[in-house]
Amino acid sequence: ILNSSTEDGIKRIQDDCPKAGRHNYIFVMIPTLYSIIFVVGIFGNSLVVIVIYFYMKLKTVASVFLLNLALADLCFLLTLPLWAVYTAMEYRWPFGNYLCKIASASVSFNLYASVFLLTCLSIDRYLAIVHPMKSRLRRTMLVAKVTCIIIWLLAGLASLPAIIHRNVFFIENTNITVCAFHYESQNSTLPIGLGLTKNILGFLFPFLIILTSYTLIWKALKKAYEIQKNKPRNDDIFKIIMAIVLFFFFSWIPHQIFTFLDVLIQLGIIRDCRIADIVDTAMPITICIAYFNNCLNPLFYGFLGKKFKRYFLQLLKYIPPKAKSHSNLSTKMSTLSYRPSDNVSSSTKKPAPCFEVE
């Protein structure tokens, strides 16, 4: 059947290749981290939804994006206990085929929805700050809501492969099932395509748009400050811009790098078992980093504004929202907000407190 040299070779390969990410500390550490993300995420994002919807009455374009961001996070967080159990049980899936598909789709959906929403938020900030007058007609509540519907549809489309190809798989002659991606011969290139799509559509393009938007905002504000040399410069704005871009980048870059390495392994470009083991081990850790930061996003963006902060702390003290609607103008914006009256090019006015939730 197999000659001795081949058998020796196989044994050597097996000795060189650890258990493909199946390490005991992973089965303890990852469920613990998932549990922390679940508790913090559910608490934080629920409060964000309450603050934006009930306290701030969902009046601005950016608040629509922020609300949807929190809702997308909540959808994902609800499936997190399933993944915690799955990892704690050493990648055994006891929840059946239907939940296998739903939970898998939820992970993919959240990635694309949140990244697309953050991208739209950055474009909205750019339009509000750099072109406040020109963009006034375009930046309406209707446009924001339609944009969110399109984002949810696109994210749904991106998570379809998980719904189609994720199925429970009985491991051999045991009653143990796993929630695995199934690929037939005719679609064996799909995992490579999915990995590269995640890299390009789920990170590279959005990051370039976010980077461009905030770079242009930076330049516009710098120009405005240069015009008003006698006014004190507010460096906080520039720190916030840096924080937004770096937070997004460092949240996702580990997961995206390991996703790309996994693609290279599947293509046979990387054939080193040690690297394969590192990728398999690191993948759930990078997921923890990405999704934990992702779930903090609504809080992070919200807390850039004084009003959001005030309502948030008010809610923590159980102070109910006022029954009457706020008197804000609909042109005022949430998260990185800009007052259209404070035109960036104006030399007589101070640059807007543009990173404020109104």
Partner: nanobody, 118 residues
Framework: EVQLVESGGGLVQPGGSLRLSCAAS????????MGWYRQAPGKGREFVAA???????NYADSVKGRFTISRDNSKNTVYLQMNSLRAEDTAVYYC????????????WGQGTQVTVSS
């Protein structure tokens, strides 16, 4: 990418033998466990035999002692030697490559028909 191509199926008389081969193009790690599954008409896919990179094997109770699974990593090929075939072994035999970790994947071949009939 991983592609699995089965061969060796056909018509055989009860008590006869067949050897199925599964050639994997693309790169199959020793971390991928290779297995054979079968699907009889009107039934679900059921496990037949599996082999790890280190050549540890596992068999379904119904084929133990009759079927032997082996693997040649240098050729990226898995074999299923089927002896003392019975009518109930009639099915489409699928080759599978799978890894069970944080991102589990199962790759399936297109299947090869095995018919045991007199």
């Amino acid at each position: 990418e991983v592609q699995l191509v089965e061969s060796g199926g056909g018509l055989v008389q009860p008590g006869g033998s067949l050897r199925l081969s599964c050639a994997a193009s693309g790169y199959i790690y020793s971390r991928y466990r290779m297995g054979w599954y079968r699907q009889a008409p009107g039934k679900g896919r059921e496990f037949v035999a599996a082999i790890s990179g280190g050549s540890s094997t596992n068999y379904a109770d119904s084929v133990k002692g009759r079927f032997t699974i082996s693997r040649d990593n240098s050729k990226n090929t898995v074999y299923l030697q089927m002896n003392s075939l019975r009518a109930e072994d009639t099915a489409v035999y699928y080759c599978a490559a799978y890894k069970i970790d944080s991102n589990p994947r199962v790759y399936w071949g297109q299947g090869t028909q095995v018919t045991v009939s007199s």
